[in-house]
Every structure is written in structure tokens, then in C-alpha cells.
């Protein structure tokens, strides 16, 4: 196989022709040393992926369902091209499905059984696989067959094509079941119309149904969307109210050696010359020979899916929880509303220990899960591999923006009893140096920096967020001469001055030596000019209180913090000398298990808190010597958010502003796939 | 400096029984939660079962009703008493002190484990 060549996957006689024709085409407008298109002809779409996966084929198009056979083992595909809708500017790469009611009843998510419901069709997303696969676990025992179980949950439905014969109770509220427009009540328009004439009491649609038939504002605010969070939204807020997000139809490679660049090479080439009104005698966009052939007709061109997004994340965790309910008919044997333990996500192998040994006295109620980054572990949480973490205001930004909410937040400085229902205002970002250099904030240019991460706080987002405002670029290793900042590319300035150990030089977590408040403080003491930290960071490491070698002689008034006005103040005065305010570190999770999580971590720092005063025959949760695992050291407790409780809310409007306007600077992988 | 010290180990048939045992020696008396970890060839250290200070334990699901984790504060000793041994329970095992710090590598030599037929 040429090493340019692109085998395209086809599934019928009209896919084939069609897919030659796009081979003919692609030849005579790309250079020969360009790409090119081979076709391979199968029986059907799981031939296609058992081909890819066997390196028989490349590449092919599928529906969201198929896109979950091909991430299962031993297929192992991955998203990495996405067919878009509606315009270049605004591309809908995703639909949302959705259950709408009438606002004027009463019931939530929860509460459905006994009500009448509405579907587009049996076996279709939106309408049947994604409520029934996420109500799957609520309906009544026996659940095979799947309909009769349907049947007996609703008091009434009208599910278009079920077998009225053997299931009456899901065609009562259209008799027959009719599988085509001539059913009133068939597909998205039919099942909205179900609910709109008051025979059905929720409809599960796409987001877009609604607006497609109701276009007046005020008739569409005759209805709400129910909640997976058993609450209800307007049906102007799908993105934070839906059961589900679909992706529409997506090209899948080969995890490994899968040749996407070479895939999205031939495909923008295709939708330049051949997308949407490019030419008259190829249109990748539809086909005299049949509907949808190797691509959706209605597409208006290609996406190229973020490296970082695999299967999982691209298909999210409502979708796969469905659609595995479905598959495989197990169901937990607790109760759905009973907490199961929570997962704690823990970074590489020294927070891993800690964090067994927080599960071995919390007697099971927390479990360990391990990944090597801060977005890796963010990752996991958002497929249900974790439940959840503790995060810098920085990760929480990304973790917010991939769909996590801010559970608790870390307090440092409020005693007890009153942590626990305090909101502390944050913590202080400075810029230390040694008391005997001349530097100031005015002369770092040239300079060796040390940082806590790359996309941290008070290392990261504050001191680069003022620097870029004055220099206009994001080249900030060209600024500082050398530095570490944990998390840049490894070939990056800024990763000369990191002391690894080798393997794990310059990552993101503990097993490099200056990662972290302690580990920048440490550059700063034995290489480094200027260490961008948290206010406590310097006291917390002199003065004996860090036994460490590195540490234990280190005086206070050794050191000094750089003011943003050019002067330069003693690190007792964070609150007259620092770049900016910081919001604290907050745990966080993905939105059904918050409430889980909250519960069981009250009650774990009731036991191991801060009112357990020796650590050394004891388990602390806020203790490890300085290198803050799972949380920071100096935690006095977590404290309940009341109303803060979005990760806008939380960090607030300036923070928010600061690290978004950062963002044209981004390196973060996982911030690129979650905004996809 | 502390020493872990396990030992017990051996080749066993599935369904066997071993006791492992695990003394620690050294400067620091065992006062703290005491665990017992596994390692497979190519796989991760990954948590067998724990004692806290106060004898309450806490096992992986993979050994839950199989496995008893027992400890001898006087002997500074923790104990690991495997029944019903399955070919997937082959592996190095270990013990840890976590009051030594999450830090420090005070892993002792381990002890193997092999289960086959």
C-alpha cells in the first residue's frame, strides 16, 4: 500500500461506484505526491471497522452507534474526522438529545414512571436508545424483553414501529405504531406533536425539534427540558439540560498507526474542491447513485477532531452509560440513588499511596484510580473511569469547560468550627526572588524561571496572563532565558532547568522534583532567579518546617516578593506585593455524582481532617510533608459552595476573563477537545 | 533507616493456602495503617488489602473473601492469609508502612507468589 494512500471503507454497490469516482476525482486535482483515495468494498459498516482494525482498510464513516462498536476492544478505532452542519461559522458537529414537557406540570427526571411518553421510533437515538438505555436500571424486573419493560414503566406511550400486537401499552397513544409520516405522531416532529396535543406527558427529541416547530419565542416557553440532575431548564439551555450529546456522523481510524493526518489532508483537500457548491462534476456532499453515500448529503464539510479526544470523551459519558445499559442489561445492585464508593483520581504513584491508604481507613468508601497528568485525571473523570479530585483554579477552568462542576472548596484560612460554611476569598499569586538579587518585575526578561505547572494558577495563568498583556505574545520561553515549568514541551527552554529524575523530567506531576508550590520554591533555592508560587510557599518551606535536605536551613528573610508597581516587599506582606488573587483549589466532579461526593468527603474530613492532631500515628487527609498530595497541605477543611457551585461562579468573572484570554496561548490538548 | 522484611511466599497449587508475613525493623516502630501490595510482570503495584491502627481492614475487590489481613502491633507484624489461591494471584507481593511516608521508597524485596497447576 502506497504510504500516501487513504482506503476508504465502502458498504454497497452505490458506495463503491461513489467512492471511485471521489478516487478519480481526488487524483486529478492533488499533486502526485499528495494523497490519494483507494477503495475497499465490504459486506457491511462492522466489516468496514473489523477491516480498519485488522489494517485491511483506513478509514470510514459512521453513525454514533457504530463510532461506540468501533471504540470497543478488540477494534480499538478512534474519532478523527467529524462531518459539520449548518454553516462554516457556526458548524454543528453534535446533536443534544432531549425529554421535554410542558412547564405547566410537575415532575422531574426521577419521576417519569407511570407517565405517558412520546418517542421518534423504536431503536432510534434520541428517541429510544438514549432515555431508555438512561432510564434502563429504573424500569421493572424482567427487563428482557426491553419493550414489555418500557411498557410497564410508562402508563402510555407512542413508540412509532414497536410490535403493537405484542406491546399495546407502547402504541396507546397512536394506535398501530404506524413507521412512517403517515403515523401523526412519527419521528422528532410526530413525538413533539405527541406531547403538544396533550396525548404524551414527555417527548424525547433532538434539541433542534423544538425550535423547528414552534419558531415563536413565546409558544416555545410553554415548554421546559428535564434534567439528568432532576431539575428543569428552559429549552434555550440544551447544552446544560440533555440526556445525551450525539455526534452526528464521524470518520474513525485505527488508534495506532491510524494515519489521521494523512485522513484530514485528503478530506480538507475534498471539501475544497469538492464540498458544498465547489463543482459540478464531483460533489462529495451527495450522489446521483443514492442517499448518504460515504457521506451525509446534509453535510457542509469536515472538522478535524482534536489528537486528544478519543472514543469516550468524543461520544461522552450519558451516551456510552446508555447505550452499554442497552448492550449489555446489567444494572448495579445497590440502588441507582445510593452512593457507591468515589473514585479518587490520583497523580502518578506518590499521591496513588496516599490515597490507598485514605481507602484502607475509610474502610472502601473511596477508591483509587492513578493517571500521569492533572488532564489525564480530568479525562477519567469525565468517562466515569474516576469520580473525582482536587484541582488549582486553573484546572478547575479546564474541567469546567469539559463539563465538571466545583464540588467543595479547599479553605486555608478559616479555623473551626465555621470552615466548613465559610467562602474564603482566595490566596495570593506572588513572584519571589532572593532578597540578594536586584530583580524586579520590570527586569525578568532573561531571567530563570520557575513555575508550578504549565495552566496552574498562581505558576502559570496569573504571572503569563500579565506577561503576555505586555509583551503581546505567547512565546514566553523566548522571554525568560530558561526556566521549568512542569507540562512544556520537553524540548521547550522552559524545561531546561527541571531536575526530573530523566524519564519524568518536566512532567506534570510529583516524580518531577520541582513540580508543584514546593517544587518551584525548591528551583528558585538551588537554580533558579524568580519562582511564581502561593504567599504560604515561602513560610511554609524555611525556618525548619520542610525537614528536607534542600530545605531545612532556608531562612524567611532570605527572600522577597516582586510588587507589580517595580518594588519589592517582604514575603509577610503578600497583601500589599502580589500579581493577583487566586481562587482556592476545589474538588471537583462530573455533575451526577456531586452530591455523592460532597456527602462522603464532609464526612471522611470529620474523621480525618484537620482535627486530627498526630499525623504520625494517624491518617491526615490535608497532610504530606509539604508536597501537597490529593490536597494542599495548609487545607484547614473543605467548605460548601452554596450558590457557587459552576466553575464560572467559582473561579469569578476576572479569573475567568484572565485565563480565557490566555487561551490564544494555550497548550492544554484536553481544553482543545473539550471545546471541540 | 527501616526495613520491611516479608516472607511466606512459595509455588502452590490453585485452591492452596499461603500466609505471608511481613516484619518491620528499624527506627521507626510500625504505628500507622499497614498494607499488602501486589506486582505482575508489566502491570502496575496495585493494592491487595490494608489494616489501620485500629485493626479495621479493607480489601481489592479481586480478593475479598479469599484473603485475611491481620496485624501484631507488639511484633510490629502484619500478616496476609491467602486461601482459595487462583493462577491470577501470581505475582511479587509486598508490604508498606505509610507512616514511612508516600515519598521514601521503603519497599521491602518483595516475596513471590506462584500459582499453577
Known amino acids: 500500500v502506497p504510504e500516501k494512500s487513504v482506503r476508504w471503507c465502502a458498504v454497497s454497490e452505490h458506495e463503491a461506484t461513489k467512492c471511485q469516482s471521489f478516487r478519480d476525482h481526488m487524483k486529478s486535482v492533488l499533486p502526485s505526491n499528495g494523497p490519494s483515495v483507494a477503495c475497499v468494498k465490504k459486506a457491511s459498516h462492522l466489516d468496514c471497522i473489523r477491516a480498519i482494525a485488522a489494517n485491511e482498510a483506513d478509514a470510514v464513516t459512521l453513525d454514533a452507534g457504530l463510532v461506540y462498536d468501533a471504540y470497543l476492544a478488540p477494534n480499538n478505532l478512534k474519532p478523527v474526522v467529524a462531518e459539520f452542519y449548518g454553516s462554516k461559522e457556526d458548524p454543528q458537529t453534535f446533536y443534544y438529545a432531549v425529554a421535554v414537557v410542558k412547564k405547566d406540570s410537575d415532575f422531574q427526571m426521577n419521576q417519569l414512571r407511570g407517565r405517558k411518553s412520546c418517542h421518534t421510533g423504536l431503536g432510534r437515538s434520541a428517541g429510544w436508545n438514549i432515555p431508555i438505555g438512561l432510564l434502563y436500571c429504573d424500569l421493572p424486573e424482567p427487563r428482557k424483553p426491553l419493550e414489555k419493560a418500557v411498557a410497564n414503566f410508562f402508563s402510555g406511550s407512542c413508540v412509532p414501529c414497536a410490535d403493537g400486537t405484542d406491546f399495546p401499552q407502547l402504541c396507546q397513544l397512536c394506535p398501530g405504531c404506524g413507521c412512517s409520516t403517515l403515523n401523526q405522531y412519527f419521528s422528532y416532529s410526530g413525538a413533539f406533536k405527541c406531547l403538544k396535543d396533550g396525548a404524551g406527558d414527555v417527548a424525547f427529541v433532538k434539541h433542534s425539534t423544538i425550535f423547528e416547530n414552534l419558531a415563536n419565542k413565546a409558544d416555545r416557553d410553554q415548554y421546559e427540558l428535564l434534567c439528568l440532575d432532576n431539575t428543569r431548564k428552559s429549552v434555550d439551555e440544551y447544552k446544560d439540560c440533555h440526556l445525551a450529546r450525539v455526534p452526528s456522523h464521524t470518520v474513525v481510524a485505527r488508534s495506532v498507526g491510524g494515519k489521521e493526518d494523512l485522513i484530514w489532508e485528503l478530506l480538507n483537500q475534498a471539501q475544497e474542491h469538492f464540498g458544498k457548491d465547489k463543482s459540478k462534476e464531483f460533489q462529495l456532499f451527495s450522489s446521483p447513485h443514492g442517499k448518504d453515500l460515504l457521506f451525509k448529503d446534509s453535510a457542509h464539510g469536515f472538522l478535524k477532531v482534536p489528537p486528544r479526544m478519543d472514543a469516550k470523551m468524543y461520544l461522552g459519558y450519558e451516551y456510552i452509560t446508555a447505550i452499554r445499559n442497552l448492550r449489555e442489561g446489567t444494572c448495579p445492585e445497590a440502588p441507582t440513588d445510593e452512593c457507591k464508593p468515589v473514585k479518587w483520581c490520583a497523580l502518578s504513584h506518590h499521591e496513588r499511596l496516599k490515597c490507598d491508604e485514605w481507602s484502607v481507613n475509610s474502610a472502601g468508601k473511596i477508591e483509587c484510580e492513578s493517571a500521569e497528568t492533572t488532564e489525564d485525571c480530568i479525562a477519567k473523570i469525565m468517562n466515569g473511569e474516576a469520580d473525582a479530585m482536587s484541582l488549582d483554579g486553573g484546572f478547575v477552568y479546564i474541567a469546567g469547560m469539559c463539563g465538571l462542576v466545583p464540588v467543595l472548596a479547599e479553605n486555608y484560612n478559616t479555623p473551626n468550627p465555621n470552615c466548613e460554611n465559610t467562602a474564603e476569598e482566595g490566596y495570593f499569586a506572588v513572584a519571589v526572588v532572593k532578597s540578594s538579587s536586584d530583580l524586579t518585575w520590570d527586569n525578568l526578561k532573561g531571567k530563570k524561571s520557575c513555575h508550578t505547572a504549565v495552566g496552574r494558577t498562581a505558576g502559570w495563568n496569573i504571572p503569563m496572563g500579565l506577561l503576555y498583556s505586555k509583551i503581546n505574545h505567547c512565546r514566553f520561553d523566548e522571554f525568560f532565558s530558561e526556566g521549568c515549568a512542569p507540562g512544556s514541551e520537553k524540548n521547550s527552554s522552559l524545561c531546561k532547568l527541571c531536575m526530573g529524575p530523566s524519564p519524568n523530567l518536566c512532567e506534570p506531576n510529583n516524580k518531577e522534583g520541582y513540580y508543584g508550590y514546593t517544587g518551584a520554591f525548591r528551583c528558585l533555592v538551588e537554580k533558579g532567579d524568580v519562582a511564581f508560587v502561593k504567599h504560604q510557599t515561602v513560610p511554609q518551606n524555611t525556618g525548619g518546617k520542610n525537614p528536607d535536605a534542600w530545605a531545612k536551613n532556608l531562612k524567611e528573610e532570605d527572600y522577597e516578593l516582586l510588587c507589580l508597581d517595580g518594588s519589592r516587599k517582604s514575603v509577610q506582606e503578600p497583601a500589599n506585593c502580589h500579581l493577583a488573587r487566586a481562587p482556592n483549589h476545589a474538588v471537583v466532579a462530573r455533575k451526577d455524582k456531586a452530591d455523592c461526593v460532597q456527602t462522603l468527603l464532609l464526612d471522611q474530613q470529620r474523621m480525618f481532617g484537620s482535627s486530627v492532631t498526630d499525623c504520625s500515628s494517624n491518617f491526615c487527609l490535608f497532610e504530606s510533608k509539604t508536597k501537597d498530595l490529593l490536597f494542599r497541605d495548609d487545607t484547614v477543611c473543605l467548605a460548601k459552595l452554596h450558590d457557587r457551585n459552576t466553575y464560572e461562579k467559582y473561579l469569578g468573572e476576572e479569573y475567568v476573563k484572565a485565563v480565557t484570554n490566555l487561551r490564544k496561548c494555550s497548550t492544554s490538548p484536553l481544553l482543545e477537545a473539550c471545546t471541540f | 533507616q527501616v526495613q520491611l522484611v516479608e516472607s511466606g511466599g512459595g509455588s502452590v497449587q490453585p485452591g492452596g493456602s499461603l500466609r505471608l508475613s511481613c516484619a518491620a525493623s528499624g527506627s521507626i516502630a510500625s504505628i500507622n495503617t499497614m498494607a499488602w501490595y501486589r506486582q505482575s510482570p508489566g502491570k502496575q503495584r496495585e493494592l491487595v488489602a490494608g489494616i489501620t491502627r485500629g485493626g479495621s481492614t479493607n480489601y481489592a475487590d479481586s480478593v475479598k473473601g479469599r484473603f485475611t489481613i491481620s496485624r501484631d502491633n507488639a511484633k510490629n507484624t502484619v500478616y496476609l492469609q491467602m486461601n482459595s489461591l487462583k493462577p491470577e494471584d501470581t505475582a511479587v507481593y509486598y508490604c508498606?508502612?505509610?507512616?514511612?511516608?508516600?515519598?521514601?521508597?521503603?519497599w521491602g524485596q518483595g516475596t513471590q507468589v506462584t500459582v499453577s497447576s
Open positions: 508498606t508502612d505509610y507512616s514511612l511516608g508516600y515519598y521514601q521508597d521503603y
